[in-house]
Interface confidence: low
């Protein structure tokens, strides 16, 4: 009988949101404030994640689930579970070690994050440039020069390569 009892863990009856309190004869106690247990049978509650500084609370901590953070305006999440916040830049810029820098000629970034990417080289697909690229927008490719009616002109595509010394950091 005693052997059977020892195999049955009394803590297994404690639901999520509680912990098995060894100091109180293994009764199920509610998780203290600012802590949680997401599964039953826990012997401790985990401390809630604190969304401080550049982080802000996206989902409150409850007794059964951890808080979830996102980033304050002007920053965006990086990493699993928003483990880091990275500064936003403007469209047409990229973040370097020295801060936000404009995209080099021939590259663009249409988002507030990420790096500047080369404009599409329309000629590789046998097409012509219909709309010039900018720091914020890629070029728009049009029909191939052979498809154009006589007298129509196309914009000469610029070289898509980055300028030397302007690789993303």
């Amino acid at each position: 009988f005693e052997r059977t009892r020892s195999l049955q863990d009394p803590c297994s009856n404690c639901p999520a949101g509680t912990f098995c309190d060894n100091n109180r004869n293994q009764i199920c106690s509610p998780c203290p404030p600012n802590s949680f247990s997401s599964a039953g049978g826990q012997r401790t509650c985990d401390i809630c994640r604190q969304c401080k500084g550049v982080f802000r609370t996206r989902k409150e901590c409850s007794s059964t689930s951890n808080a979830e953070c996102d980033c304050t305006p002007g920053f965006h999440c990086l990493g699993a579970g928003c483990s880091m916040c990275e500064q936003d830049c403007k469209q047409g810029q990229e973040l370097t070690k020295k801060g936000c820098k404009d995209c080099c000629f021939g590259t663009f970034n249409d988002q507030k994050r990420g790096i500047c990417r080369p404009w599409t080289n329309c000629s590789l697909d046998g097409k012509s440039v219909l709309v010039n690229g900018t720091k914020e927008r890629d070029v728009v490719c049009g029909p191939s020069p052979a498809d154009l009616s006589p007298g129509a002109s196309s914009v000469t595509p610029p070289a898509p390569a980055r300028e030397p010394g302007h690789s993303p950091q």
């Epitope: 509680t18 600012n34 409150e60 901590c61 007794s63 808080a67």
Partner: nanobody
Framework: EVQLLESGGGEVQPGGSLRLSCAAS????????MAWFRQAPGKGREFVAR????????DYAESVKGRFTISRDNAKNTLYLQMSSLRAEDTAVYYC???????????????????WGQGTLVTVKP
Amino acid sequence: EVQLLESGGGEVQPGGSLRLSCAASGWAFGNYGMAWFRQAPGKGREFVARLAWNGGSTDYAESVKGRFTISRDNAKNTLYLQMSSLRAEDTAVYYCARQRSYSRYDIRTPQTYDYWGQGTLVTVKP
């Protein structure tokens, strides 16, 4: 916008009872712990009672244990404080407060709470 509005205060004789209510709006009431504090004339704000977000745990000041009961109705976004066996020393303005999601302070300190109501006056006199 977060709002807390207390009601139910008034004048009562010693030994009498009152039930205070705190109506919450503008946020997910059921996700937060709530508390009652009070402030007597010329004194600091004093912890009265606290209730966890899900009603799972309560805390009371020693001076009100056995006389006051804190409860909540998450469906109605309302916090309650049932006060009985009232004494003259219970005279104060009573405030409800929302517990911060995270705090390094003890749950009985005002710093643990981020939003407060305007208060309702409870007067106990013969």
